[in-house]
Interface confidence: low
């Protein structure tokens, strides 16, 4: 959840044990979730764009207060604006909710380029275009923030969908999705289809546009083509996965696969870019530059700082290579690959000075905290967060942007040996300073 190149967050919240609990084995595996009925009421329930985040409408409190909430698989707190702010059009008013309960505890979440702080409580929460249930969930009421809310983004809070281990202030604060699964019969799984527009959206277009779907408790087969391929969740904190090989236009980067996962690789809907560890980023950019050498771009472009523009409709997609990430498969010595197009990693932006042109930012950037498969990756795929089976599924998204020559792809199986060696083991001492 990165800011600028990152969206705001990078930590989270969750919840103290709650009394409201329906009898249900929380580790019960759902049936093949897509067969449990129609999810039509959840299709198209997201809005937004990759640069400012995708959000879902939620209601909090009694009577219900409606808020737009950023969907963030890279953090674990449900946190909402609870005081006026120049970038908020509405906010959560605890004193107007008859069901609000104060936990008499504060929370402070610093991150690389800013922070938010607030007061912890619980209240009744539901998702109008989600499952027909109401849960009592932990809420961080944000009373102070710096460089967190984004002007024009149209969201007022954040839904951290990762695991309790990275919740703030500590892992005793139960995350929203854990509360949802405990208190209802919703299967322990959700899936995301993020739909990049492929062209810059102005403010009114973003408000009017469909941004995608969050299917809570299942899989909707209409949202993808081909087969779903699953990679194991390595550890339940972030949604951590293992990358075993990287190719640019089919050419192997030929790096020790540990480098790809140094110090981790995560799937994060709250991050804009594909972020790569320093060495991997340098090698990837070198290879992408070589592949696209028919045109020369300023250094600032490759650093994500400068736009490149072409006359409307003339973007030379064909000179840019496809990028393939090979992920560990569910079967021993088997992997599969996901392939994205330049239409995913060149992010359309509005350039006021040259509004007749199509302008883009390079949406691959350097990371000091491992690989982050952010919105530019996720916009190519339908991604299933199968928490019950501790795995993440990828299929080609029915809404991904492509051209007549190439399409995003999910393909396999490939034989890959010693994949376990690709994972990096973070020293215990490092974990206490996680993502501040």
């Amino acid at each position: 959840t990165q800011h600028g190149i990152r969206l705001p967050l990078r930590s989270g919240l969750g919840g103290a044990p709650l009394g409201l609990r329906l009898p249900r084995e929380t580790d019960e595996e759902p049936e093949e979730p897509g067969r449990r009925g129609s999810f039509v009421e959840m299709v198209d329930n997201l809005r937004g764009k990759s640069g400012q985040g995708y959000y879902v409408e939620m209601t909090v409190g009694s009577p219900p207060q409606t808020l737009n909430i950023l969907v963030d698989t890279g953090s674990s707190n449900f946190a909402v604006g609870a005081a006026p702010h120049p970038f908020l059009h509405r906010y959560y008013q605890r004193q107007l909710s008859s069901t609000y309960r104060d936990l008499r505890k504060g929370v402070y979440v610093p991150y690389t380029q800013g922070k938010w702080e607030g007061e912890l409580g619980t209240d009744l929460v539901s998702i109008p275009h989600g499952p027909n249930v109401t849960v009592r969930a932990n809420i961080a009421a944000i009373t102070e923030s710096d460089k967190f809310f984004i002007n024009g983004s149209n969201w007022e809070g954040i839904l951290g969908l990762a695991y309790a281990e990275i919740a703030r202030p500590d892992d005793s604060l139960e995350p929203f999705f854990d509360s949802l699964v405990k208190q209802t019969h919703v299967p322990n799984l959700f899936s995301l289809q993020l739909c990049g527009a492929g062209f810059p959206l102005n403010q009114s277009e973003v408000l009017a546009s469909v941004g995608g779907s969050m299917i809570i408790g299942g899989i909707d087969h209409s949202l993808y083509t081909g087969s779903l391929w699953y990679t194991p969740i390595r550890r339940e904190w972030y949604y951590e996965v293992i990358i075993v090989r990287v190719e640019i236009n089919g050419q192997d980067l030929k790096m020790d696969c540990k480098e790809y996962n140094y110090d981790k690789s995560i799937v994060d809907s709250g991050t804009t870019n594909l972020r790569l560890p320093k060495k991997v980023f340098e090698a990837a950019v070198k290879s992408i530059k070589a592949a696209s050498s028919t045109e020369k771009f300023p250094d600032g472009f490759w650093l994500g700082e400068q736009l490149v523009c072409w006359q409307a409709g003339t973007t030379p997609w064909n000179i840019f290579p496809v990028i393939s990430l090979y992920l560990m498969g569910e079967v021993t010595n088997q992997s599969f690959r996901i392939t994205i197009l330049p239409q995913q990693y060149l992010r359309p932006v509005e350039d006021v000075a040259t509004s007749q042109d199509d302008c883009y930012k390079f949406a691959i950037s350097q990371s000091s905290t491992g690989t982050v498969m952010g919105a530019v990756i996720m916009e190519g795929f339908y991604v299933v967060f199968d928490r019950a089976r501790k795995r993440i599924g990828f299929a080609v998204s029915a809404c991904h942007v492509h051209d007549e020559f190439r399409t995003a792809a999910v393909e396999g199986p490939f034989v890959t040996l010693d994949m376990e060696d690709c994972g990096y083991n973070i020293p215990q001492t490092d974990e206490s300073t996680l993502m501040t």
């Epitope: 005081a83 120049p86 908020l88 059009h89 008013q93 605890r94 009373t143 002007n151 009114s204």
Partner: antibody, heavy 120, light 108 residues
Framework: QLQLQESGPGLVKPSETLSLTCTVS??????????WSWIRQPPGKGLEWIGS???????YYNPSLKGRVTISVDTSKNQFSLKLSSVTAADTAVYYC????????????WGRGTLVTVSS | EIVLTQSPATLSLSPGERATLSCRAS??????LAWYQQKPGQAPRLLIY???KRATGIPARFSGSGSGTDFTLTISSLEPEDFAVYYC??????????FGGGTKVEIK
């Protein structure tokens, strides 16, 4: 029933500092969901937002007045205050204090207003 | 800064008639617009927020509509107490919070 009441001198000399206080009664100024604001209205003219303050002291000001305006809060007295420096006749107006409420950014509760005249 | 332009400046009508007041924004403010009523010697009072939602205690004869740049406040049947000045205000982007110049509804 929450009420707001402005107080302060009705006459200020040019180049001096205008000082007003808004007292909140019937409820606490500390409720975290509210911003407290100042708005003014020159005689016979429209409304102009001056600025807002949150209980922590965080402030937002109208850029057209920035540099001259200071809003502060005293939670122990349940009051917030406005100071406008280097006043001229153009600052003559009815000054209102107001609360931002409704879980949104509109002014849902207003004081009755106090007329401040800038004149020597 | 977003500029709000209200029209007409003055509206002369009789009690029982329908009043239609317009507010136009210099750029889109989505639905983040409010209407206030101000009577002589009194503070403004919030009537409508989020373009179309009536504030607490506001009679049903007041309604708001519009989104983007064009908004309308309608008073379906004017009561004697409705003759006043009406202001629109946007909070789509602030600071500053901006108001329109006002429309005076007077008795014909």
């Amino acid at each position: 029933q929450l009420q707001l009441q402005e107080s302060g001198p009705g006459l200020v000399k040019p180049s001096e500092t205008l000082s007003l206080t808004c007292t909140v009664s019937g409820g606490s100024i500390s409720w975290s969901s509210y911003y407290w604001s100042w708005i003014r209205q020159p005689p016979g003219k429209g409304l102009e937002w001056i600025g807002s303050i949150y209980r922590s002291g965080r402030t937002y000001y109208n850029p057209s007045l920035k540099g001259r305006v200071t809003i502060s809060v005293d939670t122990s007295k349940n009051q917030f205050s406005l100071k406008l420096s280097s006043v001229t006749a153009a600052d003559t107006a009815v000054y209102y204090c107001a609360r931002v409420g409704h879980g949104i950014n509109y002014f849902d509760l207003w004081g009755r207003g106090t007329l401040v005249t800038v004149s020597s | 800064e977003i500029v709000l332009t209200q029209s007409p400046a003055t509206l002369s009508l009789s009690p029982g008639e329908r009043a239609t007041l317009s507010c136009r924004a210099s750029q889109s403010v989505s639905s983040y617009l409010a209407w206030y009523q101000q009577k002589p010697g009194q503070a403004p009072r919030l009537l409508i927020y989020d373009a179309s939602k009536r504030a607490t205690g506001i009679p049903a004869r007041f309604s708001g509509s519009g989104s983007g740049t064009d908004f309308t406040l309608t008073i379906s049947s004017l009561e004697p107490e409705d003759f006043a000045v009406y202001y629109c205000q946007q909070v789509y982007t602030w600071p500053p919070r901006t108001f329109g110049g006002g429309t005076k509804v007077e008795i014909k």
